[in-house]
């Protein structure tokens, strides 16, 4: 056998090159036939009425032909025939790769609520071979479940991702990325998650700055509430008691002037949105007014637990009191 060919893999729409090579040629007729065994080239002449085939080279040792705008129907075995004694035949297989026509991502719900499980589907249509679909949430790879549908040698792949969403996922992209031999680089599509979550409430003491509340001083607390949608209602209440008459409420701020011991108690900031409500408590303890210097030494320790409860413990060495819990977030 001194007739040689090589298999060809080509992307749909591109150019395939078919080469019939002869070692030790005696100038015998070389023919190239298509998978239907119709003659494409007889020596350097193309009898076949398909002008996509063009002669690249013809000599006694090679017949080289290009096929432009390759389609999936061109796939198959192409035969090189060399009419020596005995006649020789060799075939080259053209494999046509078809990149996915369309990549579509579909989220079951435009807006999800924290803790909810949502379904995300990604479909890569009409590729050959079947596409591999990978899922990412931000930079984290997730595992989906793929189904492959075959139709006329083409494959449509649908991958399903079940995703339990958390508030941290709001604004994070869910990325459907395809891997396919006909695709160079990244082919991907993404949708940004919109996650609604109940407010997170945090109380900030904006005055006094040193954090120690004494009789006669003023107190200013600011309630920070973050949620999605943004909380519509932020309210201050005094737990198990009436709000002092000299307290002033201004939006998220609570002012109490001229503090006295009767103001001791728990002050709660409540915030709500359509997802739910949450609150944070501030425990006010009014200390005696200062007598003389030296100034107090204040130590603040913040501990965050998994339930995001913030404990602020303030110890005043001069006051002769035990450390007390000043703020609790819920």
């Amino acid at each position: 056998q001194n007739l040689f060919t090589k298999d060809v893999t080509v992307i749909e729409g591109e150019v395939a090159t078919i080469s019939c090579q002869v070692n030790k040629s005696d100038d015998s007729v070389i023919q190239l036939l298509n998978p239907n065994r119709q003659t494409i080239y007889f020596r350097d002449f193309r009898p076949l009425k398909d002008s996509r085939f063009q002669l690249l080279n013809f000599s006694s040792s090679e017949l080289k032909v290009s096929l432009t705008n390759v389609s999936i129907s061109d796939e198959g075995r192409y035969f090189c025939q060399l009419y020596t004694d005995p006649p020789q035949e060799s075939y080259t297989t053209i494999t046509v790769l078809v990149p996915p026509r369309n990549l579509m991502i579909d989220i079951q719900k435009d807006t999800a609520v924290e803790g909810e499980e949502i379904e995300v589907n990604c479909t890569a249509m009409a590729s050959k071979p079947a596409t591999t679909i990978r899922w990412f949430k931000g930079n984290t790879e997730l595992k989906g479940k793929s189904e492959v549908e075959e139709w006329s040698d083409m494959y449509t792949v649908t991958s399903q991702l079940m995703l339990k969403v958390h508030k941290e996922d709001d604004g994070v992209p869910v990325i459907c990325q395809v891997e396919h031999p006909a695709v160079t680089g990244n082919l991907q599509t993404q949708r940004y998650l919109e996650v609604q979550y109940k407010p997170q409430v945090h109380i900030q003491m904006t005055y006094p700055l040193q954090g120690l509340t004494r009789e006669g001083d003023a107190l200013e607390l600011t309630c920070e509430a973050i949620g999605k949608p943004q909380p519509v209602m932020v309210t201050w209440v005094r737990v198990d008691d009436e709000m002092p008459q000299h307290a002033v409420l201004s939006g998220p701020n609570l002012f109490i002037n001229n503090l006295n011991k009767t103001d001791n108690g728990t002050y709660r900031c409540e915030a709500s949105n359509i997802v739910g409500k949450a609150h944070s408590d501030y425990m006010l303890y009014v200390y005696d007014p200062p007598t003389t210097i030296p100034p107090p030494t204040t130590t603040t320790t913040t501990t965050t637990t998994t339930t995001t409860t913030i404990l602020t413990i303030i110890t005043d060495s001069r006051a002769g009191e035990e450390g007390s819990i000043r703020a609790v977030d819920h």
């Epitope: 119709q38 003659t39 009419y83 020596t84 006649p87």
Partner: antibody, heavy 115, light 103 residues
Framework: QVQLVQWGAGLLKPSETLSLTCAVY????????WSWIRQPPGKGLEWIGE???????NYNPSLKSRVTMSVDTSKNQFSLRLNSVTAADTAVYYC?????????WGKGTLVTVSS | PELTQDPAVSVALGQTVRITCQGD??????ASWYQQKPGQAPVLVIY?????PSGSGSSSGNTASLTITGAQAEDEADYYC????????????FGGGTKLTVL
């Protein structure tokens, strides 16, 4: 300048064997197929078959059972034998060079079959 | 025959004439055309898409055409189309021939 020169018996009796030879002068012998075509008087052309230098043949199915083609590469010649001829085989027989199409023809040999 | 031609066609001197050939094999393969004058061997005039020693050819679907522009007296001849069976046998097939008369 390639030339095809053909010869053979011009008058045959029914049941005899027609025998014609065509010599190729100039050009490549192995680089082509070589064909025989006939034309009955006042009628159209009929393809008989073809052969290459290594003896590979392709015959018209309607004549296949009676036709034999052969080649002599040392002389750049190819031959046609048609067995059991009848009056229906009376025709001008042409040899031709095959480049898929027939680009060179011999002058033709009239073969008459008559008792 | 598996290639069909009109038996006879006539054309006025200097005019254009079109000779057609029909057959299934012409869906896949180009036809070649031969001119034959009385007592002579056929001569190749068209092959492939429109490769020509003379004349011009075209092809569409299962029909091939030979067009002679500005017909002259010397164009008067028999014209044969030829192709090959598009099955794997590749046997040669000729049309029945068209007699062209130049008036």
């Amino acid at each position: 300048q390639v030339q095809l020169v053909q010869w053979g018996a011009g008058l045959l009796k029914p049941s005899e064997t027609l025998s014609l030879t065509c010599a190729v002068y100039g050009g490549s012998f192995s680089g082509h197929y070589w064909s025989w075509i006939r034309q009955p008087p006042g009628k159209g052309l009929e393809w008989i078959g073809e052969i290459n230098h290594s003896g590979s043949t392709n015959y018209n199915p309607s004549l296949k059972s009676r036709v034999t083609m052969s080649v002599d590469t040392s002389k750049n010649q190819f031959s046609l034998r048609l067995n059991s001829v009848t009056a229906a085989d009376t025709a001008v027989y042409y040899c031709a060079r095959v480049s898929w199409y027939f680009d060179l023809w011999g002058k033709g040999t009239l073969v008459t079959v008559s008792s | 025959p598996e290639l069909t031609q009109d038996p006879a066609v006539s054309v006025a001197l200097g005019q254009t004439v079109r000779i057609t050939c029909q057959g299934d094999s012409l869906r896949s393969y180009y036809a070649s055309w031969y001119q034959q004058k009385p007592g002579q061997a056929p001569v190749l005039v068209i092959y492939g898409k429109n490769n020509r020693p003379s004349g011009s050819g075209s092809s569409s679907g299962n029909t091939a055409s030979l067009t002679i522009t500005g017909a002259q007296a010397e164009d008067e001849a028999d014209y044969y189309c030829n192709s090959r069976d598009s099955s794997s046998t590749h046997r040669g097939v000729f049309g029945g021939g068209t007699k062209l008369t130049v008036l």
